[in-house]
């Protein structure tokens, strides 16, 4: 929930904004509704459709330390426990992520499990 102070020539000093609700599907262009006293306003907004948003913002996890390197796969893993989910996000309770053992190589963390679908 976002609050904004409106200073210029407005009766309302504080608008309260709801979530950005896509017009269709789960992402893309949509509207955000604001209220201030008896006034309401709708503004255009956009929910990103990228992987980072789907995994990074909808479902937040608290991670353990990285485990030991698995010599057979050349990767190490750690487990994450759900910390917070967007209200309508169907997140897994726990996820397991892996990454290459070599700390020199920069590569993106790969998620074995992300948001779950029923």
């Amino acid at each position: 929930k976002k609050k904004e102070k409106v200073k210029k020539g407005s009766e309302c000093s504080e608008w309260t904004w709801g979530p950005c609700t896509p017009s269709s599907k789960d992402c893309g262009m949509g509207f955000r509704e604001g209220t201030c006293g008896a006034q309401t306003q709708r503004v255009h907004c956009k929910v990103p459709c990228n992987w980072k948003k789907e995994f990074g913002a909808d479902c937040k996890y608290k991670f353990e330390s990285w485990g030991a390197c698995d010599g057979s796969t050349g990767t190490k893993a750690r487990q994450g426990t759900l910390k917070k989910a967007r209200y309508n996000a169907q997140c897994q309770e726990t996820i397991r992520v892996t990454k290459p053992c070599t700390s020199k190589t920069k590569s993106k963390t790969k998620a074995k499990k992300g948001k779950g679908k029923d």
Epitope: K1, P19, K25, A85
Partner: antibody, heavy 117, light 107 residues
């Protein structure tokens, strides 16, 4: 499975305040949104607001912004709702419910708050 | 805020009959619509989430359809324990809102 146990019935005078508690046991209390809903006698359900225990983010129904205050105590896995400036119209059963979009929700048994002079 | 209108207000059926309960939203709410059952003196119980997703422990005779603005809860064959009040709720935008309820009563 999550179990929610709410505090007992309260009788209050107009103008007073009341604090209703909702103690969770079972799965992680801090991971899920806690909703508060009220139901006046013989009436339907009305959403008051919700709070997330992990960071206390709170979203209140504007109708209750001067009436309800939501808090949590992570150490005891308890959510609280304080209602101020009570009026007879606030007489209702107040429910807490823990929400997960993946598994659904779990509800407390309800707390009857009666406001009477 | 989004207004949910439930119909009919009261539905009178005999055990074994098919029940169709309607919930209409004042604007499109995607599939963010949930169905609850409430019996006297009890807390509401979630039957269906996100228009059509089943809930663990809820009998298969309960099903839901959507998305958009028009939603339906269907009880394929009403059992004696199904007589109760049914509410729809939307979680598409704040404030969360409930419909006025449909009372399913014995004919």
């Amino acid at each position: 499975q999550v179990q929610l146990v709410q505090s007992g019935a309260e009788v209050k005078k107009p103008g007073a305040s009341v604090k209703v508690s909702c103690k969770a046991s079972g799965q992680s209390f801090s991971s899920y949104w806690m909703n508060w809903v009220r139901q006046a006698p013989g009436q339907g359900l009305e959403w008051i607001g919700m709070i997330h225990p992990s960071d206390s983010e709170t979203i209140l129904n504007q109708k209750f912004k001067d009436k309800a205050t939501l808090t949590v105590d992570i150490s005891t896995s308890t959510a609280y709702m304080e209602l101020s400036s009570l009026r007879s119209e606030d007489t209702a059963v107040y429910y807490c419910s823990s929400w997960s979009a993946k598994r659904g929700d779990f509800w407390g048994q309800g707390t009857l708050v009666t406001v009477s002079s | 805020e989004i207004v949910l209108t439930q119909s009919p207000a009261t539905l009178s059926l005999s055990p074994g009959e098919r029940a169709t309960l309607s919930c209409r939203a004042s604007e499109s709410i995607s599939n963010n619509l949930h169905w609850y059952q409430q019996k006297p003196g009890q807390a509401p119980r979630l039957l269906i989430k996100y228009a059509s997703q089943s809930i663990s422990g809820i009998p298969a005779r309960f099903s839901g359809s959507g998305p958009g603005t028009d939603f339906t809860l269907t009880i394929s064959s009403v059992e004696p324990e199904d007589f109760a009040v049914y509410y729809c709720q939307q979680s598409n935008s704040w404030p969360l809102t409930f419909g006025g309820g449909t009372k399913l009563e014995i004919k």
